[in-house]
């Protein structure tokens, strides 16, 4: 790994769990970007593997609202506009970090959590298993 | 919004910036999932809008490694297996939260940051602008 000299102006931490418990400023840098994926692009409707977006809300999580993609079809839309089952619509998933209130219902204490979210769908060639 | 009663066992915060500065436990819940997208699925190679994955590393960020997708072609792969410019490969982007060391090089002090990452690519019908 890369060793970086510690900044002498860093806050102190007396916490016995240090460095597992850290201070985080929730005043988000780059806050003004768009969080509703429907507004930011219409790819979900124009894709050959179109998807619907579902709102997942959890007040114990930060961010409390996450949008989940669900592929509309098992197959993909072909050049004629029909669903073609020779191909598969599959979700593209990504692991993201969220903050989970811990203990529950606490406004100023969180734990990092990794969750897997479906961001959109793509059209793939199916894996064909040949029987001997 | 939903009002949730505060848990009486919550840690106190004397910080003048409260509730902007919070305590976060970095001992990640669900840590054992796979962070290298190449290992978790081969969709990037099997998609009709295939993509390459590029490793983006920043020691001042948590997580320090993020994988970025770059579409391989402007067009998509058609039913014959050829690059076809009647369709477009486009990146599916998602906003994610990361922790940025603030002040820089501090091991226990962070600020939340929103960044836009490309997770994969999908094949879309192009928007055709008709000239009057």
């Amino acid at each position: 790994g890369i060793t970086i000299p510690r900044n002498p102006g860093c806050p102190n931490s007396e916490d016995k769990n240090f460095p597992r418990t850290v201070m985080v400023n929730l005043n988000i840098h780059n806050r003004n970007t768009n969080t509703n994926p429907k507004r930011s692009s219409d790819y979900y409707n124009r894709s050959t593997s179109p998807w619907n977006l579902h709102r997942n809300e959890d007040p114990e999580r930060y961010p409390s609202v996450i949008w989940e993609a669900k592929c509309r079809h098992l197959g993909c839309i072909n050049a004629d506009g029909n669903v073609d089952y020779h191909m598969n619509s599959v979700p593209i998933q990504q692991e993201i970090l969220v903050l989970r209130r811990e203990p529950p219902h606490c406004p100023n204490s969180f734990r990092l959590e990794k969750i897997l979210v479906s961001v959109g769908c793509t059209c793939v060639t199916p894996i064909v298993h040949h029987v001997a | 919004g939903i009002t949730i009663p505060r848990n009486p066992g919550c840690p106190n915060s004397e910080d003048k910036n409260f509730p902007r500065t919070v305590m976060v436990n970095l001992n990640i819940h669900n840590r054992n999932t796979n962070t290298n997208p190449k290992r978790s699925s081969d969709y990037y190679n099997r998609s009709t809008s295939p993509w390459n994955l590029h490793r983006n590393e920043d020691p001042e960020r948590y997580p320090s490694v993020i994988w970025e997708a770059k579409c391989r072609h402007l067009g998509c792969i058609n039913a014959d297996g050829n690059v076809d410019y009647h369709m477009n490969s486009v990146p599916i982007q998602q906003e994610i939260l990361v922790l940025r060391r603030e002040p820089p090089h501090c091991p226990n002090s962070f600020r939340l940051e929103k960044i836009l990452v490309s997770v994969g690519c999908t094949c879309v019908t192009p928007i055709v602008h008709h000239v009057a």
Partner: nanobody, 114 residues
Framework: QVQLVESGGGLVQPGGSMRLSCAAS????????GAWYRQAAGKQRELVAR???????NYADSVKGRFTISKDNAKNTVSLEMNSLKPEDTAVYYC????????WGQGTQVTVSS
């Protein structure tokens, strides 16, 4: 950077056989078509054989019944089996993946001569 590496070229006697192979690095071939083109000295590049993503094959009239194209997605290769070779098959053979706007190999020389 995507590389298509051709192998198997060289000198062969008329009536002989040769197998050309093309291996792709960094990309999977399952989504792509595969093809072999050739260019003889002083002539234009011509399509010899192609195989679609789903395994449908097409051949130039001059090689039908003598050449066989195949694609192995597991091994990430496109191959050309050439039998009953003739002097007029002498050319630089190029591997192609993904059609005209896809990826091209550097070429391998095939010389049919006694």
């Amino acid at each position: 950077q995507v590389q298509l590496v051709e192998s198997g070229g060289g000198l062969v006697q008329p009536g002989g056989s040769m197998r050309l192979s093309c291996a792709a690095s960094t990309i999977g071939l399952s989504i792509y078509s595969g093809a072999w083109y050739r260019q003889a000295a002083g002539k234009q590049r011509e399509l010899v054989a192609r195989i679609t993503r789903r395994g449908v094959t097409n051949y130039a009239d001059s090689v039908k019944g003598r050449f066989t194209i195949s694609k192995d997605n597991a091994k990430n290769t496109v191959s050309l089996e050439m039998n009953s070779l003739k002097p007029e098959d002498t050319a630089v053979y190029y591997c192609n993946v993904g059609g005209e706007d896809g990826y091209w190999g550097q070429g391998t020389q095939v010389t049919v001569s006694s």
